[in-house]
Amino acid sequence: ELCDDDPPEIPHATFKAMAYKEGTMLNCECKRGFRRIKSGSLYMLCTGNSSHSSWDNQCQCTSSATRNTTKQVTPQPEEQKERKTTEMQSPMQPVDQASLPGHCREPPPWENEATERIYHFVVGQMVYYQCVQGYRALHRGPAESVCKMTHGKTRWTQPQLICTGEMETSQFPGEEKPQASPEGRPESETSC
């Protein structure tokens, strides 16, 4: 079941998943000047079964000049606000995701992909937060958020992380402790 909302936004922090649960969508977004091909899917889908999962559909981008599109007149800043999800300059493989049944690895980049990946997560997904460069993490608890189902509605737990403006960066849990993966975590909360 898809989570209704996006994970919480923490000032001066980004989040990422170590692996993606089946049913997760990754939007086919393209960088400026390029567009999803006309016959292309809206998204890639993590699909499969408990023993093997993979990404279904392929994202393809084409030059926007070759498509019947109109440029929006509202001026868009080239640098938008701090990115809250995966930035694609550094593809991530922080843990051995093959050991997570029912999960997909981070999919490889596609040509002319946008810098920011837009995921639609499913119930039970866990994401991990880290402070952006130039900010230091003050932990009051786990720097992670889980999408849970409660009383028929989805919600993300609040990560216990504050990022302060000191020139020291923290790592994602999986990068400093490879065992800190979604394995063994509660997948959903259905009791009311």
Epitope: N27, S39, G40, T70, K71, Q72, T74, Q76, Q80, I118
Partner: antibody, heavy 114, light 107 residues
Framework: QVQLQQSGAELVRPGTSVKMSCKAA????????IGWVKQRPGHGLEWIGD????????DYNEKFTGKATLTADTSSSTAYMQLSSLTSEDSAIYYC???????WGQGTLVTVSA | DVVMTQSQKFMSTSVGDRVSVTCKAS??????VAWYQQKPGQSPKALIY???YRYSGVPDRFTGSGSGTDFTLTISNVQSEDLAEYFC?????????FGGGTKLEIK
């Protein structure tokens, strides 16, 4: 909570135009396409087109090229659709949709009548 | 354009029954199909994405299946609140297209 709030019903004259709005809340407006869908009794649902507020690109169903104009204002997280040269065929409920069709607005009823 | 055909405009069923709504695409659309439920006077509600994945809050009596050109929405243990019109949609290629709808009537 993700919400798409559409503007109210419109009663308009043939030959004129109408502009309706769709205000998004509860998610990052610039991250997701916003599409528009037309519904007329006996005609089912028709996809009009969509706009990406972040990239600013727009796609139209060829059937609605020249009829519909899609715009978006990122400062207010609002998408707009203008319909021109209205006829009775344009009398319908118009929905905005987002987040890969997961979320739908409540609809705007447009009635074209002399 | 891809034509999505829902051959049955109306279906009649009883509470507790199992009913299957079908949808046929004029060409291969993979699993890029969604199902929507629309109750009288309301906007459509998304039930299923990618042919078989349920959205949050959708009861598990709603099941989607199929790929390629043939798709089915199955409602097991039909409830009175399932009285609605059901639409399929393909988003495999532009322009995205919808089926004509199937109205479910409860006996």
């Amino acid at each position: 909570q993700v919400q798409l709030q559409q503007s109210g019903a419109e009663l308009v004259r043939p030959g004129t135009s109408v502009k309706m709005s769709c205000k998004a809340a509860g998610y990052t407006f610039t991250n997701y396409w916003i599409g528009w869908v037309k519904q007329r009794p006996g005609h089912g649902l028709e996809w009009i087109g969509d706009i990406h507020p972040g990239g600013g690109y727009i796609d139209y169903n060829e059937k609605f090229t020249g009829k519909a104009t899609l715009t978006a204002d990122t400062s207010s997280s609002t998408a707009y659709m203008q319909l021109s040269s209205l006829t009775s065929e344009d009398s319908a409920i118009y929905y905005c949709v987002s987040r890969n069709f997961a979320k739908w607005g409540q609809g705007t009823l447009v009635t074209v009548s002399a | 354009d891809v034509v999505m055909t829902q051959s049955q405009k109306f279906m009649s069923t009883s509470v507790g029954d199992r009913v299957s709504v079908t949808c046929k695409a004029s060409q291969n659309v993979g699993t890029n199909v969604a199902w929507y439920q629309q109750k009288p006077g309301q906007s459509p509600k998304a039930l299923i994405y990618s042919a078989s994945y349920r959205y949050s809050g959708v009861p598990d009596r709603f099941t989607g299946s199929g790929s390629g050109t043939d798709f089915t929405l199955t409602i097991s243990n039909v409830q009175s609140e399932d009285l609605a019109e059901y639409f399929c949609q393909q988003y495999n290629s532009y322009p995205y297209t919808f089926g004509g709808g199937t109205k479910l009537e409860i006996k």
